[in-house]
């Protein structure tokens, strides 16, 4: 064969991935591989994951002579060792005025009165602990409740007899019940006064309120 067909092991270099070719004989060569590669022509990226140290649930992803960690959302950093501050990342992590408290691997919400749940989005059912009188209907509010009384009952807890039931106010007066003590309050029409709106008044004085 002519000299132009002579095989020169390192020309061109068979070594890949930055490997350096060294001729070891007439027809032989050796590749000196860069760190992270192996094989007769440095064709293989060595898997660095068997010896990984990804922390806190991180998943190893092989690199070149190193590895990286794919972190769960609560962690960051090359090895997932850095805690993510969810309170900075999500300013509205806690609803309804709740206060965000960062923790290793997560966060917590300190809820204001009346709210509960991981993000303070659940209105506490105050009716669960309410003492509305049987027969009345409890309505849940934020950090409170109210009782809807059946006819004949009054007071915040519907525990009082409704004094208006006996129509104590005269002359077309408006009867209201004091929610604290159950007593009636007469709002007298023009020209009348007194607890029951039974007394005449001078012209010019109108709409008197009387409590009983």
């Amino acid at each position: 064969a002519g000299s132009d067909s002579l095989y020169v092991p390192c020309a061109p270099s068979p070594c890949v991935n930055g490997g350096t070719c060294r001729q070891t004989g007439d027809f032989t060569f050796e590749c000196n591989c860069l760190p992270g590669f192996e094989g007769s022509t440095c064709e293989r990226n060595i898997d660095d994951c068997p010896n990984h140290r990804c922390q806190n649930g991180g998943v190893c992803v092989d690199g070149v002579n190193t590895y990286n960690c794919r972190c769960p959302p609560q962690w960051t950093g090359q090895f997932c060792t850095e805690d993510v501050d969810e309170c900075l990342l999500q300013p509205n992590a806690c609803q309804n005025g709740g206060t965000c408290a960062n923790r290793n691997g997560g966060y917590g919400c300190v809820c204001v009165n009346g709210w509960s749940g991981d993000d303070c989005s659940e209105n506490i059912d105050d009716c669960a602990f309410a003492s509305c009188t049987p027969g009345s209907t409890c309505i849940d509010r934020v950090a409170s409740f109210s009782c809807m009384c059946p006819e004949g009952k009054a007071g915040l807890l519907c525990h009082l007899d409704d004094a208006c039931i006996s129509n104590p106010c005269h002359k077309g007066a408006l009867c209201d019940t004091n929610p604290l003590n159950g007593q009636y309050i007469c709002t007298c029409p023009q020209g009348y006064k007194g607890a029951d709106c039974t007394e005449d008044v001078d012209e010019g004085n109108s709409h008197h309120h009387h409590h009983h």
């Epitope: 760190p35 068997p50 010896n51 990984h52 140290r53 922390q55 060792t81």
Partner: antibody
Amino acid sequence: EVQLVESGGGLVQPGGSLKLSCAVSGFTFSDFYMEWIRQASGKGLEWIAAQRNKANDFSIVYSASVKDRFTISRDTSKSTLYLQMNSLKTEDTAVYYCSRDGGKLALDAWGQGTLVTVSS
Amino acid sequence: DIQMTQSPSSVSASVGDRVTITCQTSEDIYSGLAWYQQKPGKSPKLLIYGASRLQDGVPSRFSGSGSGTDYTLTISSLQPEDFATYFCQQGFKYPLTFGGGTKVEIK
């Protein structure tokens, strides 16, 4: 409070076997990498085995000096880490520590150690 | 395996002295370095992790620095309870490897 307590050490003849235990408390055992480290008298620290956490399928790594002779395992129901040591050699004589890998690339909690003596 | 070269192997110092211990690794460990203190008959105690972060409960006179392959532990003002042996450890990849130790003795 995080606590690790090793037991099971003692005197054993070359070629013999021994099983070390490490009872842990004060943390969620399955969440952490656990390691065995040993220290020959007056010498430095030598890492010998690790078991990763549940998130990493409790995968295991050994040092070349104990591979195929020692086995690391854990029983999460008993919160106990084990080191089964077979074909013991005189050079395995050391104090054996179990330690918790605290998620910081560092060993943040250690047991008090248990002495293993391999001698005829 | 990653080789750890710790120096000096021993140092004599007095209370109040500043003590510096160095640790060199055979390859980049991306700040995955920890420092431990060990007293005779006791188990090691973590002082510094992540090359420079102080473990909870460790006095602030201990500090760590470095990156890549070169790391340092400094005790700014040596106290009587600091006389002990100190080890560095790389946590970048298995096998975990430790420095040979530095014994801090009373001068």
